[in-house]
Interface confidence: medium
């Protein structure tokens, strides 16, 4: 699956006009603690992985979202699930992997060209559903939206990663968000944040660059849980 350098993780905080309803957070598989990493329909074996309970997407890593691991979205405990790749179904931006966002219920690539100058965004909206008309019709509407003509450089204030130049992402810095460099191989990254701690993370890191993922550094496996160091490593 192709992931571009740009990411829509910063969009996690926003309501989902393009991303769809935030409800129905079901998943294909149930967690098998310590062995399987559920989510995104892919089984991934992660070193010492324990399903991490969460209440919202912000408590999970940049390549995860928060949802119930039960099929069909029945209410229950929510855990951090692997993000969903391009062309997978989604209900909100946070479900899509870095470099993608949720559009019309599908994770699509937020490639650089998509955000250049004036773009046309096709969205599906409903009208008259349950109220003025009998049927709710899905209506394809073409919206012309002015985007930033000049991309934010490092340190520029931003709302989302698409506001930033190539190689940068939009991350929290104190109580605002600025464009920061996407992490390179070997750089320290943030993974599986504990409940509530994300709110304290006033210096948020970017995600790992293309072809890299945030994993426990090999020589830190024996370290205590609290001091485990995660770095960007080749897949």
């Amino acid at each position: 699956t192709l992931n571009s350098v740009l990411n829509s993780n910063a969009i996690k905080n926003l309501p989902p006009p393009l991303g769809g309803a935030a409800g129905h957070p079901g998943s294909a598989v149930s967690a098998a603690p310590g062995i399987l990493y559920p989510g995104g329909n892919k089984y991934q074996t992660i070193d010492n992985y324990q399903p991490y309970p969460c209440a919202e997407d912000e408590e999970c890593g940049t390549d995860e979202y928060c949802a119930s691991p039960t099929r069909g979205g029945d209410a229950g405990v929510q855990i951090c699930l692997a993000c969903r790749k391009r062309r997978k179904r989604c209900m909100r931006h946070a479900m899509c992997c870095p470099g993608n966002y949720c559009k019309n219920g599908i994770c699509v690539s937020s490639d650089q060209n998509h955000f250049r100058g004036e773009i046309e965004e096709t969205i599906t909206e409903s009208f008259g559903n349950d109220h003025s008309t009998l049927d709710g019709y899905s209506r394809r509407t073409t919206l012309s939206s002015k985007m930033y003509h000049t991309k934010g450089q490092e340190g520029s204030v931003c709302l989302r990663s698409s506001d930033c130049a190539s190689g940068l992402c939009c991350a929290r810095h104190f109580w605002s968000k600025i464009c920061k460099p996407v992490l390179k191989e070997g750089q320290v990254c943030t993974k599986h944040r504990r409940k509530g701690s994300h709110g304290l993370e006033i210096f948020q890191r970017c995600y790992c660059g293309e072809g890299l993922s945030c994993r426990i550094q090999k020589d830190h496996h024996q370290a205590s849980n609290s001091s485990r160091l995660h770095t960007c490593q080749r897949h």
Epitope: A21, G72, R89, N129, G136, S138
Partner: antibody, heavy 119, light 107 residues
Amino acid sequence: QVQLVQSGAEVKKPGASVKVSCKASGFTFTSYDISWVRQATGLGLEWMGWMNPSSGYTGYAQNFQGRVTMTWNTSISTVYMELSSLRSEDTAVYYCARTDYYYYGMDVWGRGTTVTVSS
Amino acid sequence: DIQMTQSPSSLSASVGDRVTITCQASQDISKDLNWYQQKPGKAPKLLIYDASNLETGVPSRFSGSGSGTDFTFTISSLQPEDIATYYCQQYDDLPITFGQGTRLEIK
């Protein structure tokens, strides 16, 4: 119990349109996608597309793009599939199926609606 | 589109036999595969999801395995009520595609 009830068989002329309904009961209608799958006599299954009644998002297979429209009425838990510009090769049984949007598993199916296109 | 090829297209087996159907994807689909059973004149029924997970209420004689491009569906001990056509379905990429089906009959 959990079920999808589809409208009755239809006979149409080439070039006409057909609208098939699918009424859901026994589950939270807005918590799932509804997919439409068709099956011509003696042939396999062909996925036409899906819609999510909660968000109204739809996704159609390329083969049907421009000819198929999926709509819904949440108040009566019903989705509709309209296929236009019918041709003889559209003669098939059309199924609606409850679909989990994480793994696209179609775990509850309607009984199917037979659509015959003949001049 | 991802092509799904099932083999054999039909097979005949005796009650109690172990039956195996294979499904091959035209590209790597990880474990994004479901299996369905369709009896004559009826709608399909989901048996296996995510390549190897048994759907609720489905007898344990049905199982699935595989990942990547090669998948296997097995009935450990064939029962008379298992006479049907079986389909694999991929959901790794849109559009969703099905195999052409395998017709299973009793000898």
